[in-house]
């Protein structure tokens, strides 16, 4: 159990106050946290409060402000980018948003040796990706989608891709499919390690469906924004990897690299590359059917001038029980003899584990075992190897740092973070500099968020770089709602759920509950993480119980529960929070009477088919920008879980596991539909469809869209949707306003 | 020992077609890109196209954009231009030439090409 | 396009005696995109400066390049008779590749 200190004691109790809804929207109660931007092994650079770039050297001591907030504002700047060489600095300005990771910016190149900016042969704008080279100062970036390389900053520029053209032809930039479901980042470039080569993908969009939607604007007509997206069975893109050398980049011009050939003979996708030396590159595949992948190791033959990659250094990853790897494929982390490497997939008994790969698959060194998982591989040095896992104390969803020592036989496990501070600690990330001379641990609760500084051979905490005082100080006199980490055991499967309790909860009464759900394949809700949120308040003010329940698709507790929606989506996700629900009955503190469902995107379209699973247990229900047919959603992602909407596959539960098939059900339950009209992601169209069919059913609900916003509804949509739901709660559950 | 051999050059009527075709040997064809040069009885040179080593990217100069295609079968060691729609200001002795923007390390013979009514 | 100039058009010079060329581009090209080539009457161009100012291979070391930017200069410290020829340089930072209008190095 997870209990927040309660500090309500009857002599402050008229000090102490609830949280209000105008707290969660102010983001009065947000924390800090402090990632270090590391440049050596004992360096970093960070940000001031007052936005001067300074300089941390951890062995000196001493501290030096690189760029100042005058030459940052002189520009604009809201972002920055330190030359490998410390000779140059970008600036970037001018930021402006296009889907979840990318955007376009204006970019600026300031010359520290002079204390001047770069006059001519300046960057064009807007640019779509910009970065310096691992060493030196050589550019490379990404112009209306094609690439181009600068040997110095003043230098004119080297176009290396000219077919780049609109919602066609990107190079060295994802589409929207990939940035969003593949790769997870805006760049689809990557320096080898001394900046020799260049690797960069195309993606050719040309023959893919295009989702046109109306922004509104404030013109007297609407634009309309056309974007490739390969919804579920389309044609997808075609991608091919490119390397050029960077040191003579016009005599040979870019080379592509081979595909292994069982990946080329049927659609596929590249998943992600990784420099291992200047001269060989790890790449990834995955077959369309993404159960199978390839791992393909490739060297450069300075005879040929080409990019070799043998069969011999192929290495294959299947799941016979679901899809390869977790959310994604598992990328590798090669050891010092750049050709085996360590990575994380799922040993015999169905839990991710880190593995040692030095021929073959088959021959891998389990490194890592148990009824737990390895989520992260941070660092391999000579001598350790740095990584996540849930292992402590057998709670899923916590996170604590482990380092394994590799040099020494038999290696040896030690936990870095999992005494820290125990109470307040239970969930960590890692940075680490170069070498692991040094790490940072950024804390996410369940207590006060904190980042700390640490050497990295002994593990001896050395400062502590951001303790979130202020917020700690300023929610001494607030009523925080208790919070409850604990499992249930249903018919052999373990659900855990975390409950968040009113400050003044009594066993005794009866309490409204609220179950906040995502339960997206591959995800986690209950996580041992601090937060002030939305139903924070709900608890704290309103007196309702909230409860996240971490049901089978989800992640991090072994393949069984992971790969149980393996081709059925929207059945096993509804049926568990359903059964934890019946279970929060049991337990005598829920008002039955009064229950109610909601969640965003993947758990819109849970709660939708939950409120619509004819239980009568839930009373009323809110789904924002939801999935209501998986036949609407993005093809990488949706297929990966359901295979394809064709006959001779999975057509039938494609049909089977739509909201609109179930609109009949939503006659008895309050339902609240919101959506953003500009939703790149999960198109409004879902939730055009469920309308249709509930008007169609003449079933009376509630709708709210929100005009030109996409599937994060932020601004001042925030602010209006949170109200809406609130007011939407209150009114199901008879609470007073 | 690295060659380039072209062939194919001759006189053509104006608006007529010509290929051309570059043999290569004494290095690994596939892995570099080629490229076509002209030069014009008694002027300088002026590029014409080139083809990155799969074949996979084309890039041709402004003046013979839409009449001229290149091509490659590595599978025979050999570069073509297929020049459609031949004007007079197209008569030059065609090169071919390893590299793709330059330098161009390596230079065929050169076959001329001769349009004239 | 990139337009490159070359001065003098033609070079009258005796064997033994050292040979400036030079080369202007219309915009920056840097050392790191230009080369220089030699042709000889019905012969192709041969490669003599590589990139980045480099001989290529099999070059004599009298022939040298130099230059940055828009300005860029081949030299030939000692002529020798199977010097005297049409020199061009090229840029190859930008499509189309262009080249200069070529120097003719001939005999005093």
């Known amino acids: 159990i997870v209990l927040r200190p309660s500090r309500v004691h009857n002599s402050e109790e008229n000090t102490m106050r609830a949280l209000t809804l105008k707290d969660i929207l102010n983001g009065t109660f947000s924390y800090k946290t402090f990632f270090p931007n590391w440049i050596s092994g004992q360096e970093y650079l960070h940000q001031s409060a007052d936005n001067n770039i300074v300089l941390y050297n951890i062995e000196t001591g001493q501290s030096y402000t690189i760029l100042s907030n005058r030459t940052m504002k002189s520009v604009n700047a809201s972002n920055y980018g330190l030359s490998p060489d410390r000779q140059f600095v970008y600036l970037e300005s001018d930021y402006s948003k296009l889907w979840r990771y990318s955007y376009t910016a204006t970019y600026y190149i300031y010359d520290l040796s002079n204390g001047e900016f770069v006059r001519g042969n300046e960057l064009p704008r807007p640019i779509q990706y910009l970065c310096w080279s691992p060493v030196g100062s050589k550019l490379a970036y990404v112009y209306q989608n094609n690439i181009y390389l600068k040997q110095r900053p003043g230098d004119p520029p080297f176009q290396i891709t000219f077919n780049g053209r609109e919602n066609k032809i990107f190079n060295g930039i994802p589409d929207w499919v990939y940035e969003e479901e593949m790769l997870a980042t805006k760049y689809a470039l990557w320096w080898s390690p001394n900046g020799k080569f260049l690797a960069y993908a195309e993606f050719n969009d040309t023959d893919i469906p295009v989702i046109a939607y109306s922004y509104y604007g404030d013109e007297q007509y609407p634009r309309t924004i056309n974007i490739p997206y390969p919804k579920a069975g389309a044609k997808n893109p075609v991608v091919r990897i490119f390397i050029i050398d960077t040191t003579y980049p016009a005599y040979v011009g870019p080379q592509e690299v081979p595909v292994p050939a069982m990946i080329a003979s049927s659609d596929y996708y590249f998943s992600w590359l990784t420099w291992v030396t200047d001269e060989r590159v790890c790449l990834q595949w995955l077959k369309r059917v993404q159960n199978v992948s390839v791992l393909s190791i490739c060297d450069f033959r300075e005879d040929w001038q080409t990019w070799d990659c043998p069969k011999t250094q192929e290495h294959i990853e299947e799941s016979r029980t679901g899809w390869a790897g977790g959310f994604f494929v598992s990328t590798p982390v090669f050891s010092y003899d750049a050709i085996s490497y360590y990575k994380i997939f799922s040993d015999k008994d169905g839990y991710k584990h880190i593995h040692y790969i030095k021929d073959t698959v088959e021959n891998a060194i389990q490194i890592t075992s148990g009824k737990w998982e390895a989520i992260n591989i941070f660092r391999v040095t000579q001598d350790s190897l740095f990584y996540s896992s849930n292992e402590f104390e057998e709670y899923p969803g916590r996170r604590n740092i482990y380092r394994i020592s590799i040099g020494s036989y038999p290696p040896s496990k030690k936990c870095v973070t999992c005494h820290l501070r125990k109470e307040r600690c239970q969930y960590y990330t890692a940075s680490f500099s170069d070498y692991a001379k040094y790490y940072a641990l950024v804390c996410y609760g369940p207590g006060i968020p904190i980042s700390t500084l640490h050497d990295g051979r002994t593990d001896q905490e050395i400062k502590i770089l951001e303790e979130n005082k202020e917020l700690e100080n300023a929610l001494k006199n607030i009523q925080l709602p208790k919070e409850e980490i604990k499992k249930l055991e249903v018919d052999e499967i373990t659900l855990w759920y975390k409950m968040i309790l009113p400050p003044q909860f009594d066993r005794s009464k009866k309490y409204p509950l609220l179950i906040q759900v995502y339960g997206g394949p591959c995800s986690q809700s209950v996580r041992s993480v601090f937060a002030v949120n939305w139903i924070s308040y709900l608890a704290s003010k309103e007196g309702m119980v909230i409860a996240l329940v971490d049901g089978r698709g989800t992640a991090f507790q072994g393949d069984k529960l992971l790969y149980a929606v393996y081709r059925k989506l929207g059945v096993y996700e509804v049926e568990d929070q359903i059964t934890a629900v019946r279970k929060f009955i049991e337990m005598g503190f829920i008002d039955e009477k009064r229950i109610a469902i909601w969640g965003w995107s993947y758990g819109g379209y849970v709660s939708s088919l939950a409120l619509a699973s004819g239980t009568g247990l839930f009373k009323c229900g809110i789904a924002v920008a939801p999935v209501s047919s998986w036949e609407y959603y993005a093809s990488v992602y949706t297929e990966r879980f359901m295979g394809l909407p064709t006959k001779d596959d999975n057509l039938e539960h494609y049909k089977n596991s739509t909201v609109m098939a179930r609109a009949e059900y939503f006659r008895n339950v309050d339902y609240l539909l919101i959506h953003g009209t500009a939703d790149d992601n999960v198109h409004f169209q879902n939730s055009a469809q469920i309308a249709k069919a509930l008007v169609n059913a003449q079933v009376d609900f509630q709708a709210m869209w929100y005009s030109d916003q996409n599937h994060g509804l932020s601004g001042l949509s925030t602010n209006h949707l949170y109200t809406h739901m609130t007011h939407f709660l209150k009114q199901c559950f008879s609470l007073s306003d | 020992e690295v060659q380039l051999l072209e062939s194919g050059g001759g006189l053509v009527q104006p608006g007529g077609s010509l290929r051309l075709s570059c043999a290569a040997s004494?290095?690994?064809?596939?892995?570099?890109?080629m490229s076509w040069v002209r030069q014009a009885p008694g002027k300088g040179l002026e590029w014409v196209s080139a083809?990155?080593?799969?074949?996979?990217?084309?890039y041709y100069a402004d003046s013979v954009k839409g009449r001229f295609t290149i091509s490659r079968d590595n599978s025979k060691n050999t570069l073509y231009l297929q020049m459609n729609s031949l004007r007079a200001e197209d008569t030059a002795v065609y090169y071919c030439?390893?590299?793709?923007?330059?330098?161009?390390?390596?230079w065929g013979q050169g076959t001329l090409v001769t349009v004239s009514s | 396009e990139i337009v490159l100039t070359q001065s003098p058009g033609t070079l009258s010079l005796s064997p033994g005696e050292r040979a400036t060329l030079s080369c202007r581009a219309s915009q920056s090209v840097t050392s790191s995109y230009l080369a220089w080539y030699q042709q000889k009457p019905g012969q192709a161009p041969r490669l003599l400066i590589n990139v980045g100012s480099r001989r290529a291979t099999g070059i004599p070391d009298r022939f040298s390049g130099s230059g940055s930017g828009t300005d860029f200069t081949l030299t030939i410290s000692r002529l020798e008779p199977e010097d005297f020829a049409v020199y061009y340089c090229q840029q190859g930072i930008m499509l189309p590749p262009t080249f200069g209008q070529g120097t003719k190095v001939e005999i005093k």
């Open positions: 030439a390893k590299g793709w923007l330059g330098p161009f390390d390596y």
């Open positions: 083809i990155s080593g799969s074949g996979g990217s084309t």
């Open positions: 004494g290095f690994t064809f596939s892995s570099y890109a």
